[in-house]
């Protein structure tokens, strides 16, 4: 049966027990900076893009011990919940992937600014059609990450970032605070704002929607057929990029602002227990669960 | 996220230096009376002291951003500093990621075309 | 509800071997790093080692480098501590504490469990 | 021997204010998360602020913490019977590769 989170995203016309549109963002190509990737696994096999892009910190610890597997999962994991053949929510979107977290999902500003720039150059070399990238990452507030996320917003393309996991004020970290991007909280099956141990989802004015983001199923890089449940505001910036590249591929004109509108039009509202949110914070955190656009749109987005 | 709001600085920490009318021989001095800041992560475990973004003014070319990488190499191994350019910045913003000792924070302030300059700091997958 | 269960203390000669275990439950393991901490009787905190939550990397107090072993099997949601050759002055009631988070392993423990006695002693 | 230095006892009466010092260095309270636990006797030790000021969900915001250099504070207002417990800063250690707790610091109230 569907994916609980596939199903909430879903809307009721097209719940059966599968999800599946067939050609959802074919138009669109969605760039990921993340881990490395298992490029070979099934879900994501000829849909992923590995760029020779690499800029990581080294391992902390005198005693680490790299292991494939575990240097690819956070990135692939992702990479299935965007696209993947069977849990994926744009299965039509291509991906393309950089590397600016190392196998300890650590990475720095100044790698994900120069990941940034590669882009904005490859996007000068060879236009292509609507651009997406997914940042599921998140340090302090930036200032140069945040400007430098603003320009390529700028110049016609569609970020998507984690709003963190710190049960915090999103604005107080980056890329989550820049206002050009569109940064999305996680929450569970029962709408609820998701918990990890102590921490948690972050909240706040910074926010602009929230996603599933718990027990999310998607390639898993143990092996290539594996799939794994992860949870986290990354799980959730990856299904809010998935409906983004479904929507850009229906509708290629699209601006950031319109898309932006859009994403909230279609959102399921004041589902989310605000109890919660720190007192202070419910009146500034959307009440929003990112979703696809009903059937009105069905030549539009499941053609 | 979030738009239609004034820019959230939170507990970041800006640093001001002004800069003064010693230029140390530059040919291009700044414009008087305007400042370049300095700025870090304000949650120290996440700081990479060491590594600097210095960010240039909008409009700064590819070859003033080099001049001005250069010029503070030049300063910088006139006072005994080792430094080292890592990137040159184009595309999205001029600039440069240097390696370099604190201690040259204040000289890098006052060069030419410097809008502000941030300390590196981690991000982390989420 | 979360919840950390030591078990495996008891007496020991000095220079023998002592394997303590960490069963938890109510939360997914293997997405945090775990801890042990001893504190000896009428005495502070003593942190002892740590394990990040793939089991990739492993950190340890001065004091048990060389002769203590953290490990764990996230199939089985058990933490481990393989202590040998014991001293008198490993004699404390030992600790697993989870790691606030996986990445952020320096943010401190937020479950602990109700700890184990270790006797050193002839 | 501990790298984080506290004051042995605190106490003050009911309803009053304690703060609790915390002294390291660079390599650990400067340059790393703070946090405090509190152990009640014949307990096991729990969490009761983390990331210098945050408080888990159900402490109460009587307890609070807050960092300047290499120090760390605990402050806890409106004491009651109940806080008469063992507190502990506890950060990690750069130097060390390795966590360490605070000397402990146990507070009664009068």
């Known amino acids: 049966s569907i994916p609980w989170n596939l199903e909430r995203i879903t809307p009721p016309r097209y719940r059966a027990d599968e999800y599946q549109p067939p050609d959802g963002g074919s138009l669109v190509e969605v760039y990921l900076l993340d881990t490395s990737i298992q490029s070979d696994h099934r879900e994501i096999e000829g849909r992923v893009m590995v760029t020779d892009f690499e800029n990581v910190p080294e391992e902390d610890g005198t005693r680490f011990h790299r292991q494939a597997s575990k240097c690819d999962s956070h990135g692939t994991h992702l990479a299935g919940v965007v696209s993947g053949r069977d849990a994926g929510v744009a299965k039509g979107a291509s991906m393309r992937s950089l590397r600016v977290l190392n196998c300890q999902g650590k990475g720095t500003v100044s790698g994900t600014l120069i990941g940034l720039e590669f882009i904005r150059k490859s996007q000068l070399v060879q236009p292509v059609g609507p651009l997406v990238v997914l940042l599921p990452l998140a340090g302090g507030y930036s200032r140069v990450l945040n400007a430098a996320c603003q320009r390529l917003a700028r110049a016609g393309v569609v970020l998507v970032t984690a709003a963190g996991n710190f049960r915090d004020d999103a604005c107080l970290y980056s890329p989550a605070s820049a206002p050009e991007v569109i940064t999305v909280g996680a929450t569970n099956a029962q709408d609820q704002p998701v918990t990890l141990g102590t921490l948690g989802t972050n909240f706040g004015r910074c926010v602009d929607l929230f996603a599933p983001g718990e027990d999310i199923i998607g390639a898993s890089s143990d092996c290539s057929t594996c799939f794994v449940s992860q949870s986290g505001t990354s799980q959730a910036a990856a299904h809010v990029a998935g409906i983004a590249a479904m929507m850009l591929s229906a509708e290629p004109e699209l601006t950031l602002a319109e898309l932006r509108q859009r994403l909230i039009h279609f959102s399921a509202k004041d589902v989310i227990n605000e109890a919660w949110f720190p007192e202070d914070q419910r009146v500034l955190t959307p009440n929003l669960v990112a979703a696809l656009p009903p059937s009105t749109h069905e030549n539009l987005y499941f053609q | 996220g979030a738009m239609g709001q004034e820019d959230e600085d939170g507990d970041y920490e800006e640093l001001v230096l002004a800069l003064r009318s010693e230029e140390d021989g530059l040919a291009e001095a700044p414009e008087h009376g305007t400042t370049a800041t300095f700025h870090r992560c304000a949650k120290d475990p996440w700081r990479l002291p060491g590594t600097y973004v210095v960010v240039l003014k909008e409009e700064t070319h590819l070859s003033q951003s080099e001049r001005t990488a250069r010029r503070l190499q030049a300063q910088a191994a006139r006072r005994g500093y080792l430094t080292k350019i890592l990137h040159v910045f184009h595309g999205l913003l001029p600039g440069f990621l240097v390696k370099m000792s604190g201690d040259l924070l204040e000289l890098a302030l006052k060069l030419p075309h410097v809008d502000y300059i941030e300390e590196d700091s981690s991000v982390f997958a989420q | 509800q979360v919840q950390l269960v030591e078990s495996g203390g008891g007496v020991v000669q000095p220079g023998r071997s002592l394997r303590l275990s960490c069963a938890a439950s109510g939360f997914t393991f293997s997405s945090f790093g775990m801890h042990w901490v001893r504190q000896a009787p009428g005495k502070g905190l003593e942190w002892v080692a740590l394990i990040w939550n793939d089991g990739s990397n492993k950190y340890y107090a001065d004091s048990v480098k060389g002769r203590f072993t953290i490990s764990r099997d996230n199939s089985k949601n058990t933490l481990y501590l393989q202590m040998n050759s014991l001293r008198a002055e490993d004699t404390a009631v030992y600790y697993c504490a989870r790691a606030i988070a996986a990445l952020y392993y320096y943010y401190g423990m937020d479950v602990w469990g109700q700890g184990t006695t270790v006797t050193v002693s002839s | 021997q501990s790298v984080l230095t506290q004051p042995p006892t605190v106490s003050a009466a009911p309803g009053q204010k304690v703060t609790i010092s915390c002294s390291g260095s660079s390599s650990n309270i400067g340059n790393n998360f703070v946090s405090w636990y509190q152990q009640l006797p014949g307990t096991a030790p729990k969490l009761l602020i983390y990331?210098?000021?945050k408080r888990p969900s159900g402490i109460p915001d009587r307890f609070s913490g807050s960092k300047s250099g290499t120090s760390a504070t605990l402050g806890i207002t409106g004491l009651q019977t109940g806080d008469e417990a063992d507190y502990y800063c506890?950060?990690?250690?750069?130097?060390?590769?390795?966590?360490?707790f605070g000397t402990g610091t146990r507070v009664t109230v009068l």
């Open positions: 506890g950060t990690w250690d750069s130097s060390l590769s390795g966590y360490v």
């Open positions: 990331d210098y000021n």
